[in-house]
Interface confidence: low
């Protein structure tokens, strides 16, 4: 019968020709009256057979990620005869592997948008490196990633490349971050390779700021022949929020004489100070009131944030007119 | 544990239209291909198209090019599938499928299944 | 007709083992990974064996995975009553840019 053990050629070999093993009859006594064949894809080509011993070798470079196994066949002859000593035999040859390729991300660009604010832990987005060596084979291909640049603000796991935040961030002070993700196969071991990608994180806005007032003393003045209705001056407040965020509401906080209304103008977020009740000049020739704002939009969990209302104080004064 | 919930059966009459939708879970779903497999009574799977929800990009079997749009809505992690100009041969279970981070990455995770009738 | 060719109908008895074969082309399996999916009555499809031979977690390895050349195999030693189920091989295909199943093999254990 046939007599030979597994077969392993490493890939990338740069000797010439590399002994890969021996193939023999058992009924094979040295005395070279048999003649050994290799049959099939690669023979000749790739491998060859000393004819008289069996003995296989890899004749080129091999690349297991190109192809990490071939199967071949084996006859062997009695010179004498011309007859087959054995049935013709199939084997295989593996290409065992070696960490000649380094971790690749195959899903750049990574863009991740997470709120402001939000707490330690949570999870932002996976980043997922390939390795193309053979998984199976010692550490080759098994990753271990580490973040090169985004300390304080985030971290990652080390084996499943999953980012998450470790410090809270205000989208006030800065709105988007990157971050440099490096996976390192051979689990970090000497002789790893390595790869990097970049992750832009955006910062979305939650509503973590009241809106404040510009002036604590606005100075309006109205003439007692307007009419009810009358849009006597505007007051505005800012909001470091964007958006929905930053819509907001002014009202009237206090106003004894109930003699003036305020709208919100929500293009513009500018609180209009209209004339709810005429005025007369000589009944009464200023008046003194108090708006407040607050925003349109403010979710339970953020109210913390907008606990007292900003307010600021308007002085009206009336302008008196001719009156026949 | 990743999720994929998939829309209710329904019925339709020949030549009309229906679109399922598939909700995916506890992953990050820009990341992954999804894909839609159909099963008729009885049958063997059949892949239908492929889309990334992230930019969108479709590829559609052959069989089913010119009747079949696939989309992805990433504010919700939904992804659709619009079967058009039904015939009583579509009636099948709708599945979809996710994928890997490359087209010709395996279907780890499949929804349960959305059962079409076609009749008149 | 299936792209990829598998033999419609398998049997054994408990504790045997069974070889399902997946027959293709080089354009699927001959230059890309083969998977292998389980489907029992009534359910849909799970993972049984992704690229060529490996399992996901809550797979026994009574479940092995092999390709060659352009044929694959799915092989499942100490057979019980529970993998009575089909079983699909599924490949993507390079000159049809997309993927293709078998037609699928009923298992029926004895």
């Known amino acids: 019968g046939w007599v030979w053990n597994q077969f392993f050629v490493p890939e990338e070999m740069n000797t010439t020709s590399h002994h890969i093993g021996q193939l023999r009859s058992d009924l094979d006594n040295g005395n070279n009256s048999f003649q050994y064949k290799l049959l099939g894809a690669g023979a000749g080509s790739t491998f060859i057979i000393d004819e008289r011993t069996g003995d296989i070798y890899a004749i080129q470079k091999l690349d297991r990620e190109e192809r990490s196994l071939y199967i071949l066949r084996a006859q062997v002859i009695d010179i004498a005869t011309g007859r087959a000593v054995e049935p013709e035999s199939e084997f295989v040859i593996k290409v065992s592997d070696i960490n000649d390729n380094e971790p690749k991300f195959l899903d750049e660009p990574y863009e991740a948008i997470v709120p402001e604010m939000s707490p330690e832990g949570t999870l932002v987005i996976q980043v997922t490196a390939s390795d193309a060596d053979d998984p199976s084979s010692g550490n080759n291909a098994r990753l271990l990633y580490s973040l090169l640049q985004g300390q304080p603000y985030f971290s990652v796991e080390p084996t499943t490349g999953v980012i998450r935040i470790s410090s809270k961030m205000d989208r006030e002070l800065q709105d988007e971050y990157w971050v440099i993700i490096q996976a390192k196969d051979m689990i970090g071991q000497p002789g790893a390779l390595s790869g990097t990608t970049s992750v832009l994180i955006k910062l979305s806005d939650v509503n973590d700021n009241k809106p404040i007032f510009k002036e604590s003393l606005y100075r309006l003045t109205v003439s007692e022949s307007a009419p009810t209705g009358t849009s006597i001056g505007t007051i505005m407040a800012y909001d470091n929020d964007i958006g929905e965020n930053a819509e907001m509401d002014y009202s009237i906080e206090e106003d004894d004489s109930q003699t003036f209304d305020i709208i919100t103008n929500h293009e513009t977020q500018e609180g209009i100070v209209i004339l709810k009740k005429k005025v007369d000049f000589e009944h009464q020739n200023h008046y003194g009131i108090r708006a407040k704002v607050k925003n349109h939009h403010v979710p339970e969990q953020l109210m913390k944030y907008h606990t007292e209302a900003s307010t600021t104080f308007i002085k009206i004064q009336v302008e008196d007119v001719d009156e026949p | 544990q990743v999720q994929l919930v998939q829309s209710g059966a329904e019925v339709k009459k020949p030549g009309a239209s229906v679109k399922v939708s598939c909700k995916a879970s506890r992953y990050t779903f820009t990341s992954y291909y999804m894909s839609w497999v159909r099963q008729a009574p009885g049958q063997g799977l059949e892949w239908m198209g492929i889309?990334?929800?992230?930019?969108?990009?479709?590829t559609y079997a052959q069989k089913f090019q010119g009747r079949v749009t696939m989309t992805g809505d990433t504010s919700t992690s939904t992804v659709y599938m619009e079967l058009s100009s039904l015939r009583s041969e579509d009636t099948a279970v709708y599945y979809c499928a996710r994928g890997g981070i490359k087209l010709w990455l395996h279907f780890d995770y499949w929804g349960q299944g959305t059962l079409v009738t076609v009749s008149s | 007709q299936s792209v990829l060719t598998q033999p419609p109908s398998a049997s054994g008895t408990p504790g045997q083992r069974v070889t399902i074969s997946c027959s293709g082309s080089r354009s699927n399996i001959g230059s890309n990974f083969v998977n292998w999916y389980q489907q029992l009555p009534g359910t849909a499809p799970k993972l049984l064996i992704y690229t060529n031979n490996q399992r996901p977690s809550g797979v026994p390895d009574r479940f092995s995975g092999s390709k060659s050349g352009t044929s694959a195999s799915l092989a499942i030693s100490g057979l019980q009553s529970e993998d009575e189920a089909d079983y699909y091989c599924a490949v993507y295909d390079d000159s049809l840019n997309g993927w293709v199943f078998g037609g699928g093999t009923k298992l029926t254990v004895l």
């Open positions: 889309i990334h929800p992230s930019g969108g990009d479709t």
